[in-house]
């Protein structure tokens, strides 16, 4: 495939990545799938600078990111290492609360109204942010 050199329509470019900000809500798995169908992934926050950029665009609204612990340890959807990477959890989070009776914990991470992160029940219909890297080869065949 060819390298993507500019962001798709309605996506916002920032630091060699493209971001798309939803204006409706979906459960985490549905949001994850939406981004994948756009040849992207749920946003992976790797720096304080990126955190501030995303926070500016989403405002004080609960919003899914590409971080989950549905299979045990916390993982970023693009494989970025969680342990050594940037984190911005609320105090006392993540707590993986099991008390809601869902037969599982709070396995999906989201930006809260103040931008800090919380883990929550993955079924909540929060807004979401997709991200794709400009330098990534797109899946479209090159123009002949």
């Amino acid at each position: 495939g060819s390298e993507r050199t500019c962001c798709p329509v309605n996506w916002v470019e920032h630091e060699r990545s493209c971001y798309w900000f939803s204006r409706s809500g979906k459960a985490w798995a549905d949001a994850d799938n939406y981004c994948r169908l756009e040849d992207a992934h749920l946003v992976v926050v790797t720096s304080w600078e990126e955190q501030k950029f995303v926070q500016h665009h989403i405002g004080p609204v609960n919003t899914w990111m590409g971080l989950h612990d549905q299979n045990g340890p916390w993982k970023w959807v693009d494989g970025t290492d969680y342990e050594t990477g940037f984190k911005n959890w609320r105090p006392e989070q993540p707590d993986d609360w099991y008390g809601h009776g869902l037969g599982g914990g709070e396995d999906c991470a989201h930006f809260t109204d103040d931008g800090r992160w919380n883990d929550d029940v993955c079924q909540r219909p929060y807004r979401w942010v997709c991200e794709t890297e400009l330098d990534k080869a797109s899946q479209e065949p090159p123009l002949l």
Partner: antibody, heavy 126, light 107 residues
Framework: QVQLVQSGAEVKKPGASVKVSCKAS????????INWVRQATGQGLEWMGW????????GYAQKFQGRVTMTWNTSISTAYMELSSLRSEDTAVYYC???????????????????WGQGTTVTVSS | DIQMTQSPSSLSASVGDRVTITCRAS??????LAWFQQKPGKAPKSLIY???SLQSGVPSKFSGSGSGTDFTLTINSLQPEDFATYYC?????????FGPGTKVDIK
Amino acid sequence: QVQLVQSGAEVKKPGASVKVSCKASGYTFTSYDINWVRQATGQGLEWMGWMNPNSRNTGYAQKFQGRVTMTWNTSISTAYMELSSLRSEDTAVYYCARGGYDVLPGNNYYYDMDVWGQGTTVTVSS
Amino acid sequence: DIQMTQSPSSLSASVGDRVTITCRASQGISNYLAWFQQKPGKAPKSLIYAASSLQSGVPSKFSGSGSGTDFTLTINSLQPEDFATYYCHQYNDYPFTFGPGTKVDIK
């Protein structure tokens, strides 16, 4: 048994604030959301927002953003809804309702507002 | 926001009748829909969740169907205690929203 008991009726002047309480019993307070829903006389149901005392998360309908604050006191299993800058159109019965997610076969899910308070009448009049 | 509409807004029926109420969402909501019954001066009561699943303790004469944007609540063999207002409610997206209600009264 599981129940939500709300505070008594309030009469307020325009511009004032009102704080309605909702005391939960018969279940683990932190295991569920509390939703707030209001109903003007002869009108339908209007969802105002939700709060979760465990994750300390809240979500408000845009219409009430900036005017509503939902809080809680886990030690007494009580949720609160405060509405400020009251106007006559805020005259309504305000309900709290317990909410929670549950899983269905096939990894589907639903959200259940299964237990409601008795309602608190708020009258805004000069 | 997702708009919910209901029809009819009111209907008159007799004891023993079969009643059907429809609810339409302004966009697809899968099966993330509930139905509530409300009697005058009382809090709403949950009847149906996930469009078609009956809440425990609710008689089987109530049934729900539909997916996407169009949903139906059916009450078989209407009894005096069923005369009330019925609301549909979507929890597919925030803000959660309710339909305007359908009032079922005695003919």
